[in-house]
Amino acid sequence: APVPPGEDSKDVAAPHRQPLTSSERIDKQIRYILDGISALRKETCNKSNMCESSKEALAENNLNLPKMAEKDGCFQSGFNEETCLVKIITGLLEFEVYLEYLQNRFESSEEQARAVQMSTKVLIQFLQKKAKNLDAITTPDPTTNASLLTKLQAQNQWLQDMTTHLILRSFKEFLQSSLRALRQM
């Protein structure tokens, strides 16, 4: 399911409950995706020893995964709501090709990988409604994405395992950074 179910069974029993605000819906959506990533990382870590690799060893990869930096305005110091929102949406759009790559990488968690991908699409839609400055958001080039996907899928098994681990780790970090920032807005 691309949208998270109710938080608990009380949702069914409480028809008069206030509908979620836009911010609450986004918050809940990110937490839902993070739970999905956690499940996918469990499978990856059980399958290989990639999770023990240090960040420095992993840094030698040629992936250009989105990452938050001070200049993006999402941290406590130098916080800037508009700049940050643009970075979050742009980053999520850039992650989409990597989430597509993950689709055939899981055996027992195939549905979970699909749910993470679809939920991210929904999250982007939620965030685009919130953003005022949509012109500042650059959409990745489909041709570039297609050739990147082909290149990633042509890697040997070890590199594919490493790539999977790196994508999950980076996506988790990016979503956490985003959630921290969104809770200031």
Partner: antibody, heavy 121, light 110 residues
Framework: EVQLVESGGGLVKPGGSLRLSCTVS????????LSWVRQAPGKGLEWVGY???????WYANWAKGRFTISRDNSKNTLYLQLNSLRAEDTAVYYC???????????????WGQGTLVTVSS | DIQLTQSPSFLSASVGDRVTITCRAS??????LSWYQQKPGKAPKLLIY???TRTSGVPSRFSGSGSGTEFTLTISSLQPEDFATYYC????????????FGGGTKVEIK
């Protein structure tokens, strides 16, 4: 065995500065979120700040501008720079390793033994 | 600015007693709350996170519950080693806060 060891505490005069270190062994520090927490004699736990794997730092209101958290993953060390110290900053300062599921829900599952900072003239 | 209020501050109990400590948040924090135990002269120890998940190695007599603004830590049958101070910690927001910890509850021998 994973260990966190704080150092750098001691006696300092009001207005003075100090840099605390927390050396971590047995794990790759870069994979974890980290925190400093202090405890004045006979008082409760007081959060100083977090440093996350994305390198962002988040501080308690009272610590902003005076205290700075940094990390050197290559040295497996966490730091806390204390400036413009006051008598009320006298406390045991703990470093702690955290795991975060969402945003700030950083559960501190491993702590150092603490280092005492005394601010007195 | 989220604030946590723990009650009671002090609690006298006997071995075998059922003990309940409450932590109230000034605004909703979902289930993003942890509980710690601290003994004199020692560093705190994580007991429970996500309001109700026990850390490995923590005895089953410790349980956590709650969501939103009201949380409880329950010790079903107090043991001699449980006499300590307990703290709650909110994890919903760390921006514009003075402390993420509650004031603590000291559990003493009656």
């Amino acid at each position: 065995e994973v260990q966190l060891v704080e150092s750098g505490g001691g006696l300092v005069k009001p207005g003075g500065s100090l840099r605390l270190s927390c050396t971590v062994s047995g794990i790759d520090l870069s994979s974890y979120d980290l925190s400093w927490v202090r405890q004045a004699p006979g008082k409760g736990l007081e959060w100083v700040g977090y440093i996350y794997t994305d390198s962002s730092t988040w501080y308690a209101n009272w610590a902003k501008g005076r205290f700075t958290i940094s990390r050197d993953n290559s040295k497996n060390t966490l730091y806390l720079q204390l400036n413009s110290l006051r008598a009320e900053d006298t406390a045991v300062y703990y470093c702690a390793r955290g795991s975060t599921d969402y945003a700030f829900d950083t559960r501190l599952d491993l702590w150092g033994q603490g280092t005492l900072v005394t601010v007195s003239s | 600015d989220i604030q946590l209020t723990q009650s009671p501050s002090f609690l006298s109990a006997s071995v075998g007693d059922r003990v309940t400590i409450t932590c109230r948040a000034s605004q909703s924090i979902s289930n993003e709350l942890s509980w710690y135990q601290q003994k004199p002269g020692k560093a705190p120890k994580l007991l429970i996170y996500r309001a109700s998940t026990r850390t490995s190695g923590v005895p089953s007599r410790f349980s956590g519950s709650g969501s939103g603004t009201e949380f409880t830590l329950t010790i079903s049958s107090l043991q001699p080693e449980d006499f300590a101070t307990y703290y709650c910690q909110q994890g919903y927001n760390s921006n514009d806060v003075d402390n993420v910890f509650g004031g603590g509850t000291k559990v003493e021998i009656k």
